[in-house]
């Protein structure tokens, strides 16, 4: 039969080469002379020439040693042809399996592995994993099966076997009690990887195990008592730096201090943060202190670490006496923003309100007042009493200065301290509407045909507020009612102007008197352009020219 079983060839064969492997034979050779050839990677394609075939005998030849780690299997095709070159058999698959030799040592993936573990952990705790690879086969043989071991440990304190390693996975674990960072901060392990599952070639690497600090020392205040002076009202002011000492590893969570105000800060006036480098507690003011309310604060501050203590440790407490220093404080308007209702258009000299400030200082300081910002110049303020009066006409409808019926004024109070301090207040005048505007029609110019004219609808606007607005009433004056009619609609917010008699093309004044709900009357002249046309028109047509 024209078949060949898979051929196994050990790698690294010593020859001699060419080495006969197997004979290809076609039973057609009884009828005709057969010539044999092989194709495929390893024969006629890269890597060429590894295998050959004796053309006339069919012997498959190996020309050089094989390397399983380079190519583990070759797939070739055998061919049989007659003397005239005609194929006498289908191409035959030839599988050549390269069997492994233990020709590679294990290799650690790193020369030095680094891991860490907390001091004082329970035996059994995992530290790190080391890895070695072996290019040899680990599936069908033990050539590439690596076993790990610890060859030595430095230092050998408190025992020479502080760690163990998982034979197969390379996981290093703590095996003994007594890891103490303060005594041994780092261990150097010489680790071995041995192939043949521990019975073959060995390679070594180093595993450095850093012993991390556990929080077994409490931070201690040094000193424990402090006195500080702080000006009143200062926010974010550094009051005091508190110093602690901690025997744990510097800059570790077991060393870094966490400060807590335990008592004496009833008003939540203080905050304490940790300086990232010095580890000091920086006590600052969160809110301004008030000398007049309390001129001395006694704070109690406790210190712990970022990391929890691993055993019961006494916490250290510091006492800080904070003396508050008096400063000249600015007068404060009461309230800071005052809303006052006042009628628009009140007479000049009429009082609007009294707006005064209080001085937080206990000394009887004199306060003087003045207006800081009065955009329309409508007001004046008495410097001694804080009395605000009208000096101009307050106009609610003045869109330049009044927003949503409110006129905003800023006032200033100044004490006579040395140096003097000032405080500001905001006066919000809510202007009460007065019926001081009559209704106005829009538009005030109309164009209308003198034949079958269309009614002109004019909108009525009134700057005042209800009830000083609609419903409106309309009346034509100065004989305008001879040619025109004016009627207010049912809603009372538009007026309809109609041409009731023929007028020749020209421009006319229509005298329209509108009055609001409060009978405030406003006379408006409507400019009406009458055109020679029918129905609706926007501009008068030009004169007709005959041809």
């Amino acid at each position: 039969d024209w078949v060949v079983a898979p051929i196994s060839v050990p790698e690294n064969g010593k020859g001699p080469f060419p080495q006969r492997l197997n004979q290809l034979k076609s039973n057609k050779d009884r009828d005709t002379k057969i010539f044999y050839s092989i194709t495929g990677p390893g024969a006629d394609s890269p890597p060429e020439g590894v295998f050959a075939v004796e053309k006339e005998t069919g012997w498959l030849l190996l020309n050089k040693p094989l390397d399983r780690e380079e190519i583990a299997k070759y797939e070739l095709f055998g061919h049989a042809v007659s003397e005239n070159g005609a194929s006498v058999e289908d191409p035959m698959n030839i599988s050549i399996i390269v069997t492994d030799q233990n020709d590679h040592k294990p290799k650690f993936t790193q020369d030095t592995f680094r891991g860490s573990v907390l001091e004082g952990v329970l035996p059994g705790t995992s530290v790190m994993q080391v890895t070695a690879t072996d290019e040899d086969d680990a599936i069908y043989t033990y050539n590439g099966v690596v076993a790990y071991s610890i060859h030595s440990q430095e230092p050998k304190d408190p025992h020479d076997l502080m760690f163990t390693i998982h034979r197969s996975t390379g996981t290093i674990s703590v095996i003994s009690s007594g890891l103490d960072r303060e005594k041994v901060p780092e261990y150097t392990l010489t680790i071995q990887a041995t192939d043949m599952d521990g019975d073959g070639s060995t390679t070594t690497a180093v595993a450095v195990v850093e012993i991390l600090d556990a929080n077994d020392n409490a931070p201690m205040f040094d000193p424990q008592k402090y006195e500080a002076h702080v000006p009143e009202n200062a926010v974010g002011h550094e009051v005091q730096r508190l110093t602690v000492t901690d025997l744990d590893a510097p800059n570790s969570p077991a060393w870094r201090a966490t400060y807590l105000i335990m008592g004496g800060d009833d008003g939540d006036h203080f905050t304490i943060t940790t300086h990232p480098e010095s580890n000091q507690g920086i006590l600052t003011t969160r809110k301004g202190l008030d000398f007049e309310a309390k001129n001395q604060h006694t704070l109690y501050v406790e210190v712990t670490n970022e990391a929890p203590f691993v055993l019961k440790l006494p916490t250290s407490t510091a006492t800080i006496v904070v003396h508050v220093e008096d400063v000249n404080e600015a007068p404060v308007f009461v309230p800071p923003s005052k809303v006052v209702e006042v009628q628009e258009g009140i007479p000049t000299g009429e009082p609007v309100c009294v707006y005064t400030a209080e001085d937080p200082d206990k000394e009887n300081q004199k306060i003087s007042y003045r207006i800081l910002r009065d955009p329309a110049g409508w007001l004046a303020m008495d410097p001694d009493s804080g009395q605000v009066t009208a000096v101009g006409t307050l106009d609610r409808e003045d869109e330049q200065f009044v927003r949503n019926n409110i006129y905003e004024v800023m006032v200033l109070a100044m004490d006579n301290g040395s140096p003097p301090t000032t405080g500001t207040g905001t006066l919000l005048l809510t202007l009460i509407d007065v019926n001081d505007h009559g209704p106005v029609p829009e538009p005030r110019q109309i164009t209308i045909c003198n034949q079958s004219p269309v009614r002109q609808v004019l909108n009525i606007t009134d700057k005042d507020l209800s009830p000083h607005t609609s419903p409106f009433q309309a009346q034509l004056t100065d004989d305008s009612d001879i040619y025109w009619t004016a009627e207010v609609n049912e809603e009372g917010d538009t007026v309809v102007l109609s041409l009731k008699k023929f007028l020749k093309q020209d421009t006319y004044d229509v005298h329209l008197s509108l009055s609001d709900h409060g009978n405030k009357e406003q006379l408006t002249v409507i400019r009406a352009t009458v055109c020679d046309c029918h129905g609706h028109v926007e501009t008068c047509p030009g004169p007709w020219k005959g041809g």
Partner: antibody
Framework: EVQLLESGGGLVQPGGSLRLSCAAS????????MSWVRQAPGKGLEWVSA????????YYADSVKGRFTISRDNSKNTLYLQMNSLRAEDTAVYYC??????????WGQGTMVTVSS | QSALTQPASVSGSPGQSITISCTGT?????????VSWYQQHPGKAPKLILS???KRPSGVSNRFSGSKSGNTASLSISGLQAEDEADYYC???????????FGGGTKLTVL
């Protein structure tokens, strides 16, 4: 002489509590991890809990997690096991032992805990 | 169901030798040389007789020896004596919690 001496066992109703103590002598107690191992009547050994030398690291078997608390007072050379919400299946002799990592040695003489109504 | 498998009982006559096996996995017995053996007489506390597969603590008779092959450890007692009659427990370190596994125990009877 290295010695471990347990106490605190007794009869308790289901749902009740007990506190076991183990007094150590003859070795530097704070340098060694300690553990509690129990043995139900006629049964094998079961590791219950362990604590590191400083007390900062603890281990509990799933069967007691959330109910038992291991602690130690190195100033008194004493190991404790606080047992709450006790069940009938917690009935056993409780031994304290030094956990060296690869083995348990020495062992105390044991204290009997019986959970029964 | 114990994590490590031991025969429930073995027996032997005085002067004979016996072996107790302890089978685990490649993650415990097979992975570490930290197999220990404990002897427990009725009503008494366990006592360490072998650590690290075959190391005897001081005071333990050299008739006790240990070995390990693959995932199975063995305790051998030569020259059996009446006082050897007891329960024997194996234990192995493992890198996963719980870090110590116990066998179910083997009752040794000296005939």
């Amino acid at each position: 002489e290295v010695q471990l001496l347990e106490s605190g066992g007794g009869l308790v109703q289901p749902g009740g509590s007990l506190r076991l103590s183990c007094a150590a002598s003859g070795f530097t107690f704070s340098s060694y991890a300690m553990s509690w191992v129990r043995q139900a009547p006629g049964k094998g050994l079961e590791w219950v809990s362990a604590i590191s030398g400083s007390g900062g690291s603890t281990y509990y078997a799933d069967s007691v997690k959330g109910r038992f608390t291991i602690s130690r007072d190195n100033s008194k050379n004493t190991l404790y096991l606080q047992m709450n919400s006790l069940r009938a299946e917690d009935t056993a002799v409780y031994y304290c032992a030094s956990w060296g990592g690869g083995w348990f040695d020495p062992w105390g003489q044991g204290t009997m805990v019986t959970v029964s109504s | 169901q114990s994590a490590l498998t031991q025969p429930a009982s073995v027996s032997g006559s005085p002067g004979q030798s016996i072996t107790i096996s302890c089978t685990g996995t490649s993650n415990d017995v097979g992975a570490y040389n930290y197999v220990s053996w404990y002897q427990q007489h009725p009503g008494k506390a366990p006592k360490l007789i072998l650590s690290e597969v075959n190391k005897r603590p001081s005071g333990v008779s050299n008739r006790f020896s240990g070995s390990k092959s693959g995932n199975t450890a063995s305790l051998s007692i030569s020259g059996l004596q009446a006082e050897d009659e007891a329960d024997y427990y194996c234990s192995s370190f493992t890198s996963q919690i719980p870090w110590a596994l116990f066998g179910g125990g083997t009752k040794l009877t000296v005939l």
